[in-house]
């Protein structure tokens, strides 16, 4: 015997009450497959979530972050602020890059300049907390017989300045 | 697959204390350090404390220092925070999140997996 409550298309739930009709999901829920016995209630995008896809009888609505944050987790079910370049976010807030490191976006942690002398080159531009060096030609190359290598910035963890 | 799963969340009055609790399954649980985090209704991401692989070091947000405490218990891949003295600020979504490393601290976030989370009200 065929269960009557497959034949429940989405967007409706078998009514058991009603001797198992099809009944349209009631307002602010819905199902998205056949066959359900309950409709799911809709998400509701608020405070810092704002709904990027309204809630529909055969889908959730689906919330994105208002500006100054952007989404984690499956799904947006949270929102991380940004911070601005040459800041990270750390666990107590946005934090200025240390030196010898930058972040050129909004989100991600700040990462050590380029060490340029390891390929042999020179610094063409320096890096600041929010861009990285520009590395040029070797010494060599821009003036023969002299080597004044710029000597490379100090390896330290991203971000963290000492105390 | 990775998976946590938070619980423990309900509505509890100010002064109260609630115990949430996180499943983890799909990992080496006791390699890797693990953190609470929480969104207000109105504001970000907020850190609240995070705890080594061991158990050995815990960290805490100064906004739940010597109220809130987090623990693990590696037998059961379970993550825990007892929250005590609870205050209206409190009122949040919690989420149990992984971490990438198996030593933390109380600077990077270095998070990598979350759960759903679990609504924590504190309310007269």
């Known amino acids: 015997l065929q269960d009557p409550c497959s034949n429940c298309p989405a967007g409706t739930f078998c009514d058991n009450n009603r001797n198992q009709i099809c009944s349209p999901c009631p307002p602010n829920s819905f199902s998205s497959a056949g066959g359900q016995r309950t409709c799911d209630i809709c998400r509701q995008c608020k405070g810092v979530f704002r709904t990027r896809k309204e809630c529909s009888s055969t889908s959730n609505a689906e919330c994105d972050c208002t500006p100054g944050f952007h989404c984690l987790g499956a799904g947006c079910s949270m929102c991380e602020q940004d911070c601005k370049q040459g800041q990270e976010l750390t666990k107590k807030g946005c934090k200025d890059c240390c030196f010898g490191t930058f972040n050129d976006q909004k989100r991600g942690i700040c990462r050590p300049w380029t060490n340029c002398s390891l390929d042999g080159k020179s610094v063409l531009v320096n890096g600041t907390k929010e861009r990285d060096v520009v590395c040029g030609p070797s010494p060599a190359d821009l003036s023969p017989g002299a080597s004044s290598v710029t000597p490379p910035a100090p390896a330290r963890e991203p971000g963290h300045s000492p105390q | 697959e990775v998976q946590l799963l938070e619980s423990g969340g309900g509505l509890v009055q100010p002064g109260g204390s609630l115990r949430l609790s996180c499943a983890a399954s799909?990992?080496?649980?006791?390699?890797?350090?693990m953190s609470w985090v929480r969104q207000a209704p109105e504001k970000g991401l907020e850190w609240v404390s995070s705890?080594?692989?061991?158990?050995?070091?815990?960290f805490y947000a100064d906004s739940v220092k010597g109220r809130f405490t987090i623990s693990r218990d590696n037998s059961k891949n379970t993550l825990y925070l007892q929250m005590n003295s609870l205050r209206a600020e409190d009122t949040a979504v919690y989420f149990c999140?992984?971490?990438?490393?198996?030593?933390?601290?109380?600077?990077?976030?270095?998070?990598?997996?979350w759960g759903q989370g679990t609504t924590v009200t504190v309310s007269s």
């Open positions: 999140a992984k971490e990438g490393a198996t030593e933390t601290d109380d600077y990077h976030f270095n998070t990598d997996v």
């Open positions: 799909g990992f080496t649980f006791s390699s890797y350090a």
């Open positions: 705890i080594s692989g061991s158990g050995g070091s815990t």
